[in-house]
């Protein structure tokens, strides 16, 4: 089980406890419901880039 | 060959307990999600609850919320249910079933059920 | 809570006929959509899961299609075997999941 806290998931993904692995975020557009998205909302995508330097 | 084998089925009185267990060989268990599925006599079929492969996420409907504990022991590739507070409603087949495995969008094998009678 | 009904509840048909079953989701579930085959007395058994895919095992006359709320399971050629009552699924809220009230399918 996953220690609260931590994240063992690359970019782009974020940890599914209902799965006991990895997902990845960018399912999540297509089925929001899933308990994953919410950690893929807590920080920006992988390809997030800031506007200003 | 995989193989779901419920038991622990049988007739009890309202407001009784029952455990029942879904015995799981043919796979390996524990990399798979897990879930409960009823149907009363001659109706559909009913969700009743979740696990995730390592027991450490569960999920319940509505109908059995607070009444009814989803549990696992990968160690013996086992399933449970314990059902209290039963009510003459939850009478019905209980089928455990097993998660696709890249989700839980689907479950691709089923036990051949175990008949829950609750009448005084 | 997303509700699915199916239609017909139950039909008649013969050996040789096409037979089409429907699945209307309550709001759109994309192709998080399965459907189950069920003989009395026996459990469940997956026939097409994700809307079209069709399972390991499962004969070629089932196929499935559709998206959003309006989903099809299709028989192109009806078998002695095929009837049963037939269950649509959605897993768009997984785990939080909902059946169809079931299709019966007869002999005529």
């Known amino acids: 089980e996953q220690a609260p806290g931590t994240s063992p998931c690359s970019s782009g993904s974020s940890w599914s406890a209902d799965l006991d692995k990895c997902m990845d975020c960018a399912s999540c557009p297509a089925r929001p419901h899933s308990d994953f998205c919410l950690g893929c909302a807590a920080a920006p995508p992988a390809h997030f880039r800031l506007l200003w330097p | 060959e995989v193989q779901l084998l419920e038991s622990g089925g049988g007739l009890v009185q309202p407001g009784g307990s029952l455990r029942l267990s879904c015995a799981a060989s043919?796979?390996?268990?524990?990399?798979?999600?897990m879930i409960w599925v009823r149907q009363a006599p001659g109706k559909g079929l009913e969700w009743v609850s979740y696990i995730s492969p390592s027991g450490g996420s569960t999920h319940y409907a509505d109908s059995v919320k607070g009444r009814f504990t989803i549990s696992r022991d990968n160690s013996k590739n086992t399933l449970y249910l314990q059902m209290n507070s039963l009510r003459a409603e939850d009478t019905a087949v209980y089928y455990c079933?097993?998660?696709?495995?890249?989700?839980?969008?689907?479950?691709?094998?089923w036990g051949q059920g175990t008949l829950v009678t609750v009448s005084s | 809570d997303i509700q699915m009904t199916q239609s017909p509840s139950s039909l008649s048909a013969s050996v040789g006929d096409r037979v089409t079953i429907t699945c209307r989701a309550s709001q759109s579930i994309s192709g998080y959509l399965n459907w189950y085959q069920q003989k009395p007395g026996k459990a469940p058994k997956l026939l097409i899961y994700q809307a079209s895919s069709l399972q390991s095992g499962v004969p070629s006359r089932f196929s499935g299609s559709g998206s959003g709320t309006d989903f099809t399971l299709t028989i192109s050629s009806l078998q002695p075997e095929d009837f049963a009552t037939y269950y649509c699924q959605q897993s768009y809220t997984s785990p939080f999941i909902t059946f169809g009230q079931g299709t019966k399918v007869e002999i005529k």
């Open positions: 043919g796979f390996t268990f524990s990399p798979y999600p």
């Open positions: 079933a097993r998660g696709g495995d890249t989700y839980f969008d689907y479950f691709d094998y």
